[in-house]
């Protein structure tokens, strides 16, 4: 779970150990402030929930990717 | 640890409706689901639906269509499932389910409740 | 829908023997989203296996999945008296549509 460690900085200190389809996942943002311990991508899933993972990972990295297509693909 | 208790036997007559209650407790409701599993005797395991509670919308297998209504109730932590028009096959035993909905994986299980159609 | 198939319907083994249990679907199961489920007479299925390979919480080292795409296996490394009971599979990729083989019971022979 990301925590927030001011109102404008959320970091995240732990990352998921288990892979999430993309299926069930809705947007993500990326966390690069010098203020937080390490780099993460946060994901917003499909319950709304917010889960930090490693942007190292390829299945991050390609659901981001995928997510990123998804956006640019406007639904008709 | 989570548990997921079932409400009672029925007995029930064709042409009629029964309604499966499922209470969960030790565990958070919202962002999991419940799936109805139905194994008829000496049958395998049947998915008849499910909902993920945070939405509130069900999903049902095609072959129970129209048939079965799968509710929950975020405030009591209670799932629901009403199958309706029984038949002589629906006899069965019905299982309640929890899953993760960032997985599906159905990690615990009610203890079933017997439902018997006959006239 | 993903159809699972299940193979053998039955395996007749002994205790101390190696189980090989077979679950093949009509699609190929993204993720390796499949579990497998140990079954005793009157008793709720009970979760052995996630994600293809991840064993649940509890579950002895006996026990391992393995597979991908359309091919998955169970394999019980030593049957021990207690593992005689019917096992199934179960594809959970789409919320919308799970689906589960028709399962392998394991008697003892």
């Known amino acids: 779970q990301p925590d927030a460690i001011n109102a404008a900085v959320t970091c995240c200190y732990n990352f998921t150990n288990r892979k999430i389809s993309v299926q069930r996942l809705a947007s993500y943002r990326r966390i690069t402030s010098s203020k937080c311990p390490k780099e993460a991508v946060i994901f917003k899933t499909i319950v709304a929930k917010e889960i930090c993972a490693d942007p190292k990972q390829k299945w991050v990295q390609d659901s981001m990717d995928h997510l990123d297509k998804q956006t640019q693909t406007p639904k008709t | 640890q989570v548990q997921l208790v079932q409400s009672g036997a029925e007995v029930k007559k064709p042409g009629s409706s029964v309604k499966v209650s499922c209470k969960a407790s030790g565990g958070t409701f919202s962002h999991y689901g419940t799936s109805w599993v139905r194994q008829a005797p000496g049958q395998g395991l049947e998915w008849m639906g499910g909902i993920i509670h945070i939405f509130g919308t069900a999903n049902y297998a095609q072959k129970f269509q129209g048939r079965v209504t799968i509710t929950a109730d975020e405030s009591t932590s209670t799932a629901y499932m009403e199958l309706s028009s029984l038949r002589s096959e629906d006899t069965a035993v019905y299982y309640c389910?929890?899953?993760?909905?960032?997985?599906?994986?159905?990690?615990?299980w009610g203890q079933g409740t017997l439902v018997t159609v006959s006239s | 829908e993903i159809v699972l198939t299940q193979s053998p319907a039955t395996l007749s083994l002994s205790p101390g023997e190696r189980a090989t249990l077979s679950c093949r679907a009509s699609q190929h199961v993204s993720d390796a989203y499949l579990a497998w489920y140990q079954q005793k007479p009157g008793q709720a299925p009970r979760l052995l296996i996630y994600d293809a390979s991840d064993r649940a919480e509890g579950v002895p080292a006996r026990f391992s999945g393995s597979g991908s795409g359309t091919d998955f296996t169970l394999t019980i490394s030593s049957l021990e008296p207690e593992d005689f009971a019917v096992y199934y599979c179960h594809q959970y990729i789409h919320l919308h549509s799970f689906t589960f083989g028709q399962g392998t019971k394991v008697e003892i022979k």
């Open positions: 389910a929890r899953y993760d909905a960032h997985y599906g994986e159905l990690d615990f």
